[in-house]
C-alpha cells in the first residue's frame, strides 16, 4: 500500500511539476522591467522566451514575437532548448508512468516490468526537472549579468543634460514558476524511483541447509529468504495488484489596468 501511495503521489507531483514547466515556458513574464526608483510606471516592459510585451498604463498590451532566431542571445536559446527538452522528457515520463502505476491493470504485466517502467519514468522526471531548473537558472544568470551591466551604464551616462531612461530587467514570475515546477518534477521523479524499489518482484529462494547431528540427519528448510528490495522487513505475502484502483483528484480586447504598480 505504501508503495502504491508513493508511486501515485510521485505521479501526481510530477504531473503538477510538468504542467508548471509547460506554463512557465509559455509565460511572457520571464523578465520584467525593474521599477527600482519608479514604482508607478506609464509603460511597463516584460519579456518571455518567445516574445516581448509592453503594457501601457492605459491598459493596452502589445506583444511582439522575436524576429530572428540567430540574433537572440545564446542564453535565451539555451533556456528555450532546456525547457523544451524538459517538457518532452516529462511528457514521455508521464506516459510511461501511467502504464507503470500499480493501481492500473494492463493485461498480465509483470511486477518487474512495472518496476522498470516506474524507474524509467522516475529518471525521466528527474532529468526533466533538472532541465527546467537549468533552463530557468541560465536565463536568471543572463538577467543578473545584464542588470549589473545596465546599472553600470546608468551611472556612467549621467553626465549629460538629457537623460536616457535605461530599462533594466529583473526576475519575472515565470522564473519562480519554473524553479518550483522543476523542483516538483524532480521530487516526483525521486518518489517514483523509491516506489520502484518496492515494486520489484519478491523472489522466494529456498536454500536447504543440512545439519548433521549424531545418530540421525535432519534437514532444516528455513522460511523463505526475502529478496525484496523494499525498505521494510515485511515478510507478508503481497498480492500482485492492490485492491481497488486509486483515483487521484487533479487538482487570460478590452484594455486592463496595469498590475505592476
Amino acid at each position: 500500500m505504501a508503495v502504491t501511495a508513493c508511486q501515485g503521489l510521485g505521479f501526481v507531483v510530477s504531473l503538477i511539476g510538468i504542467a508548471g514547466i509547460i506554463a512557465a515556458t509559455c509565460m511572457d513574464q520571464w523578465s520584467t522591467q525593474d521599477l527600482y526608483n519608479n514604482p508607478v510606471t506609464a509603460v511597463f516592459n516584460y519579456q518571455g522566451l518567445w516574445r516581448s510585451c509592453v503594457r501601457e498604463s492605459s491598459g493596452f498590451t502589445e506583444c511582439r514575437g522575436y524576429d530572428s532566431l540567430l540574433a537572440l542571445p545564446q542564453d535565451l536559446q539555451a533556456a528555450r532548448a532546456l525547457m523544451i527538452v524538459g517538457i518532452v522528457l516529462g511528457a514521455i515520463g508521464l506516459l510511461v508512468s501511467i502504464f507503470a502505476l500499480k493501481c492500473i491493470r494492463i493485461g498480465s504485466m509483470e511486477d518487474s516490468a512495472k518496476a522498470n517502467m516506474t524507474l524509467t519514468s522516475g529518471i525521466m522526471f528527474i532529468v526533466s526537472g533538472l532541465c527546467a531548473i537549468a533552463g530557468v537558472s541560465v536565463f536568471a544568470n543572463m538577467l543578473v549579468t545584464n542588470f549589473w551591466m545596465s546599472t553600470a551604464n546608468m551611472y556612467t551616462g549621467m553626465g549629460g543634460m538629457v537623460q536616457t531612461v535605461q530599462t533594466r530587467y529583473t526576475f519575472g514570475a515565470a522564473l519562480f514558476v519554473g524553479w518550483v515546477a522543476g523542483g516538483l518534477t524532480l521530487i516526483g521523479g525521486v518518489m517514483m524511483c523509491i516506489a520502484c524499489r518496492g515494486l520489484a518482484p519478491e523472489e522466494t529462494n529456498y536454500k536447504a541447509v543440512s545439519y548433521h547431528a549424531s545418530g540421525h540427519s535432519v534437514a532444516y528448510k528455513p522460511g523463505g529468504f526475502k529478496a525484496s528490495t523494499g525498505f521494510g522487513s515485511n515478510t507478508k505475502n503481497k498480492k500482485i495488484y492492490d485492491g481497488g484502483a486509486r483515483t487521484e483528484d487533479e487538482v487570460q480586447s478590452y484594455p486592463s489596468k496595469h498590475d505592476y504598480v
Epitope: V43, E56, S58, Q163, V165, T167
Partner: antibody, heavy 118, light 113 residues
Amino acid sequence: QVQLQQPGAELVRPGASVKLSCKASGYTFTSYWINWVKQRPGQGLEWIGNIYPSDSYTNYNQKFKDKATLTVDKSSSTAYMQLSSPTSEDSAVYYCTRSWRGNSFDYWGQGTTLTVSS
Amino acid sequence: DIVMTQSPSSLTVTAGEKVTMSCKSSQSLLNSGNQKNYLTWYQQKPGQPPKLLIYWASTRESGVPDRFTGSGSGTDFTLTISSVQAEDLAVYYCQNDYSYPFTFGSGTKLEIK
C-alpha cells in the same frame, strides 16, 4: 458614440470644497482610465491624475496630491474630482479625458469652468 | 518630472504653406521594449477642448487629415502640417506619455495671415 459630459461651470467660495463630475457614455466605463487635466485661462495644460474605474486605482501628479481626490461611481458611469480648500489659483477649466493607446487622451469632455470667488 | 519644451511659441503662416513645430523632452521618450516613442500631439482650437492628433510620436489618430505628420525619436520631435488650412488655426501641444506625471509642452500657437 463615446461621450464625456461635464457641467459647463461651477462657482465655489474659497475654502469650500467642490466636486466636479464627468459622466461617460458610449463605451465600457470600467475598461478605460479617466484622466483629469487643468487649464488656467490663457495657459497650458496640466495633468492632475487618473483613475481606473474598475477598481478605483489612482495615480496623482504630486503637485495635486493634496488638492485633488479622484473617485468613480460605476453604477452611473461617472467620474468625480473633489478639490479641497480651493483658492483663486484653482480657478481654471478642468477637463476629464479617456486614456487610449500610447497613453494618449482620445476623448475629452467639454470642460468645467471652475470659478473660485467670494 | 519630464520637462517638455516647445518652439516656437507662436508662428504666423499663410494658407497652403508648410509648417513645422518642435518639441523637446528632458528625457528620452523612446521605450526600448517596443521601440516606440511615447509622445502625443494635440490640437486645441479656441473655446474647445484639445483634440488628439498623433500618438506614439508618428501614429495618426483616425479621422485626422494626412497633412498632419509627426516625426522624431528620443528627445526631439516635430509636428509638420504639409499645407496649412484656415481651420488649422489652433494651439498645438505635445505631451510626454512615457512616465508619470504626464507633462505637456507650453504650446505653439499657429496663426493664419
